[in-house]
């Protein structure tokens, strides 16, 4: 049945999320005659590309074509052949490529050039590859979750089955955690957005939204870990780093050259008397938490209120969807339930981090050790970021919903990006016939 024209009149779109740690391809589908309705686009496939993020191919760009092949071939199978030529393909690269561009614009261009060459060889309507801004990443994530939750229209079919009991018309805030950056986006209540860089105005489906957004580059979970290691090794007395964010008994050798490869560790760079150092885990949540807090500079704020590093943050308002690594990490730790209080999460993290590494390896034998070893840090980092970074409290924690998918579509920026680029979010509430519309982000 593959590659046969479908009887119903449907359209497809493809978005590749070129993240810092990996690339994922998403295929979306919608009824052609309902392009302007809210909630009609849904994800039919996610294909995770095998290998690291595209920024890691900087010294081996000729391998990018092969790297993308499997998922692009999967798209060829899923989408009927008759639809190939009219199916748009977009690639958005996020913070991993932002960091590479900071190091060298020429190297970032080289990677994107080969990505564009490779993707344009497929029979789809390739629309280009680009590094999206942190502001776009936050905005499109916010659009995605609110579109899927039916927040942009009274006509939605989802309210009866979306498991979040909330005031129907209040939008959700979006909390996105990646490997290299993290985004916070929400509509503040009657609050002036004091920093123009953090203000977005949308008119969607006949309603105006004044949205706050910020992307913290270098504060994704992987780059935050590199930052923490670079900070801690500065004051180590020798090449042994006793690290409370890793399980007791865990050992790992780190190359100093790898530590200082990223622009995120530049502020901690120091000439060290060794080329390698050894991490020895001690598994102490409280100490790990304290070490992480040193990454957040809260001593300076030129606004009425800040998150950290002098970045304006209005008072938190309403419910929040926390997705991407917020969800994956908390899901692994079994802490995504709405019923788990912040105190309970902290207590569980303390227990988890204190478990010996050998015990952890046995309990989670199917999980790659590289990932498994970092859940203690990642979980602690999530708590630190949400509580001290963004000022959630034990009470407002109840308003954080850890979301992987909504109605079968992944929460993340890709759907919002495609909706915008295909002009499928009208400014005004659609009538029975589709209206003309333009781009909003």
């Amino acid at each position: 049945t593959q590659n046969k024209a479908l009887p119903e009149n449907v359209k497809y779109g493809i978005v590749l999320d070129a993240g810092s740690s990996h690339t994922s391809l998403y295929i979306y589908k919608w009824p052609a005659e309902k392009e302007n309705d809210t909630g009609v686009v849904h994800q039919v496939e996610e294909c995770r590309v095998k290998g690291p993020g595209i920024s890691k191919f900087v010294q081996k760009v000729n391998e990018i074509g092969i790297y993308l092949t499997d998922c692009m071939e999967r798209a060829r199978e899923v989408i009927p052949r008759s639809q190939h030529q009219e199916t748009p393909v977009y690639l958005g690269a996020t913070a991993g490529m932002r960091l590479l561009r900071m190091e060298s614009e020429e190297l970032a261009d080289r990677v994107l050039d080969v990505v564009e060459r490779s993707l344009s060889n497929y029979p789809f309507d390739f629309q280009g590859a680009r590094i999206i801004t942190g502001q776009e990443e936050g905005a499109y994530g916010w659009i995605t979750i609110n579109y899927l939750l039916g927040k942009f229209s009274q006509k939605t079919r989802w309210f009866s089955i979306v498991p979040y009991e909330t005031n129907n018309q209040e939008t959700f805030g979006a909390l996105d955690l990646g490997g290299a950056s993290t985004q916070v986006t929400f509509v503040p209540q009657n609050q002036t957005i004091e920093s123009p860089d953090n203000a977005l105005q949308f008119r969607l489906y006949g309603k105006d939204y004044n949205v706050y957004t910020h992307s913290f580059l270098c504060y994704g979970k992987d780059q935050a870990l590199w930052q923490k290691l670079a900070k801690d090794i500065q004051v180590a007395s020798n090449e042994i780093l006793r690290d409370p964010c890793f399980h007791p008994g865990y050992k790992k050798v780190v190359n100093v050259s790898d530590l200082y490869k990223t622009p995120c560790t530049k502020r901690f760079e120091k000439k060290l008397p060794f080329d390698q150092f050894r991490i020895q885990g001690t598994g102490d949540y409280e100490q790990c938490h304290q070490s992480i807090l040193e990454l957040f500079n809260t001593s300076y704020c030129p606004y009425s209120q800040c998150a950290f590093n002098g970045i304006f943050l209005p008072p938190l308002q309403g419910d929040f969807g926390a997705f991407s690594a917020f969800y994956f990490v908390m899901k692994f730790l079994n802490l995504t339930s709405e019923k788990v209080s912040q105190e309970k999460v902290t207590e569980m993290m303390k227990k988890f981090c204190a478990q010996p590494w050998e015990e952890i390896k046995t309990s989670y034998a199917g999980v790659k050790e590289k990932y498994l070893s970092e859940y203690c840090f990642s979980g602690t980092y999530i708590l630190s970021l949400l509580l001290q970074g963004y000022h959630f409290t034990a009470d407002s924690w109840e308003h954080i919903h850890f979301i992987g998918k909504i109605q079968g579509s992944d929460a993340g920026w890709t759907l919002g990006y495609m909706l915008n680029l295909t002009n499928m979010i009208p400014a005004e509430q659609p009538l029975s016939t589709p209206l003309s519309h333009s781009t909003y982000v």
Partner: antibody, heavy 120, light 113 residues
Framework: QVQLVQSGAEVKKPGSSVKVSCKAS????????ISWVRQAPGQGLEWMGG??????NYAQKFQGRVTITADESTSTAYMELSSLRSEDTAVYYC???????????????WGQGTTVTVSS | GIVMTQSPDSLAVSLGERATINCKSS????????????LAWYQQKPGQPPKLLIY???TRASGVPDRFSGSGSGTDFTLTISSLQAEDVAVYYC?????????FGGGTKVEIK
């Protein structure tokens, strides 16, 4: 100053293949995206494909019939067109640039052109 | 792919007069990341390869006389020769390098009236 020097004119039979070379001098070849453009007699310019950083790509019209390669050791790019027909009679040019990222200034250096005549 | 449409097909202008060539793309070639239009203009004289005149829609390539100027954004572009000289007799092509496949306009032949 980069220069592109192409191989000489060719006369080919229908169904055969032709391989045109384009040698670069005076620049770092590995960082040059090279495009191939053809021009039939009295007609306009038509982009066939290009290569940059080891990866080639082709216009849909020529997919499966054209192969673009590059040999960094000799700073030479090649364009091979197979299953030739009379409509392939044209001047074939190589040019530096054309890619959005690596060739952001357009095609700024051109070879002198290679005339390929396909005739039985 | 993006279709490039040039007008007019040919143009006869007196020496010293202004020549204007239009180019329209079937979709925008303005790249939001850097606010640049990925459009170039070329001049081709008989028996010669094309020569780059303008890139990024309005930036003159090195050595190009300032009587040549490019303007426009998004989908509509113009090449202007402010004061036509005898050596400007040629065919002029616009080309987008925003998306693969790269595409050229059909060309505009400029002659002296």
């Amino acid at each position: 100053q980069v220069q592109l020097v192409q191989s000489g004119a060719e006369v080919k039979k229908p169904g055969s293949s032709v391989k045109v070379s384009c040698k670069a001098s005076g620049g770092t070849f590995s960082s040059l995206p090279i495009s191939w453009v053809r021009q039939a007699p009295g007609q306009g310019l038509e982009w066939m494909g290009g290569i940059g950083f080891g990866t080639a790509n082709y216009a849909q019209k020529f997919q499966g019939r054209v192969t673009i390669t590059a040999d960094e050791s000799t700073s030479t790019a090649y364009m091979e067109l197979s299953s030739l027909r009379s409509e392939d009679t044209a001047v074939y040019y190589c040019a530096r640039g054309g890619a959005k990222y690596a060739g952001r200034y357009g095609m700024d250096v051109w070879g002198q052109g290679t005339t390929v005549t396909v005739s039985s | 792919g993006i279709v490039m449409t040039q007008s007019p097909d040919s143009l006869a202008v007196s020496l010293g007069e202004r020549a204007t060539i239009n180019c329209k793309s079937s979709q925008s070639v303005l790249f939001s990341s850097n606010n640049k239009n990925y459009l170039a203009w070329y001049q081709q004289k008989p028996g010669q390869p094309p020569k780059l005149l303008i890139y990024w829609a309005s930036t003159r390539a090195s050595g190009v006389p300032d009587r040549f100027s490019g303007s426009g954004s998004g989908t509509d572009f113009t090449l202007t020769i402010s004061s036509l000289q005898a050596e400007d007799v040629a065919v002029y092509y616009c080309q987008q390098y925003y998306l693969y496949p790269l595409t050229f306009g059909g060309g505009t032949k400029v002659e002296i009236k």
